[in-house]
Amino acid sequence: DLQEADLDLLRVTLSSKPQALATPNKEEHGKRKKKGKGLGKKRDPCLRKYKDFCIHGECKYVKELRAPSCICHPGYHGERCHGLSL
């Protein structure tokens, strides 16, 4: 529980796991995405659609959930790493 976490525990460069998963309202589950040219690989939605999803953190797209998650920078928390938690 971050409420009880010691301040020193937050002094890590990045969390080892996503702090929150957020499922956007308008995720297009039905549509097939176009594959990258000849690579047979989908582009990372974090680089496009969710480029600015994580305010103070790094975006990681979870394919199984079809949703972005955020790895928060030190001092921040929340599903989009929006909050200054110190």
Partner: antibody, heavy 114, light 108 residues
């Protein structure tokens, strides 16, 4: 030990610009956001904005968007805040603050006077 | 933006007295994002309490914090001369992060 070094004072003429510096040491500069806070004489604290040194991304208080520009120089682990079109209202102490807020610079006293 | 209103603005207390400073937010915020700072004359502010109730490193146990939603408070169990300072609350719930107007604590 985290340290944030700021010049003690700056004297600038009205209408001019000034670039305040904050040299960081004792931690990995690019891993933590840097904040800037304004304090007018005898007044409270105002959050100006913050910058992510790893990629230069910024978030500003709308009130300071046309006044302050935050930048960093990763090679020297230094954060900068440029203030433009200075008036007497900009005379204040400006602090740089580490993202966990338990380390503050000593503050730079900016005086805008002709 | 979220406005934080502190009360009282100024107060004087005798050594040993219990002090309570309140911080009222214009909209509800998570307790994870409410922090308190102490600023002594001529010095930079110092983190006192983070996330509503957690004491920062080196802060004496006579300081405590509590609250939720829009109402938060800072308590000094027994006032000491070294506690003379201005105290600020801060919210980190939404940008712009804002500070309260401050409470100046003096000694009688």
């Amino acid at each position: 030990q985290v340290q944030l070094q700021q010049p003690g004072a700056e004297l600038v003429k009205p209408g001019a610009s000034v670039k305040l510096s904050c040299k960081a040491s004792g931690y990995t500069f690019t891993s933590y956001w840097m904040h800037w806070v304004k304090q007018r004489p005898g007044q409270g604290l105002e959050w100006i904005g913050e910058i992510n040194p790893s990629n230069g991304r910024t978030n500003y208080n709308e009130k300071f968007k046309s006044k302050a520009t935050l930048t960093v120089d990763k090679s020297s682990s230094t954060a900068y805040m440029q203030l433009s079109s200075l008036t007497s209202e900009d005379s204040a102490v400006y602090y740089c603050v580490w993202s966990l807020f338990d380390y503050w610079g000593q503050g730079t006293t900016l005086t805008v006077s002709s | 933006e979220i406005v934080l209103t502190q009360s009282p603005t100024t107060m004087a207390a005798s050594p040993g007295e219990k002090i309570t400073i309140t911080c009222s937010a214009s909209s509800s915020i998570s307790s994870n994002y409410l922090h308190w700072y102490q600023q002594k004359p001529g010095f930079s502010p110092k983190l006192l309490i983070y996330r509503t109730s957690n004491l920062a490193s080196g802060v004496p146990a006579r300081f405590s914090g509590s609250g939720s939603g829009t109402s938060y408070s800072l308590t000094i169990g027994t006032m000491e001369a070294e506690d003379v300072a201005t105290y600020y609350c801060q919210q980190g719930s939404s940008i712009p992060f804002t500070f309260g107007s401050g409470t100046k604590l003096e000694i009688k």
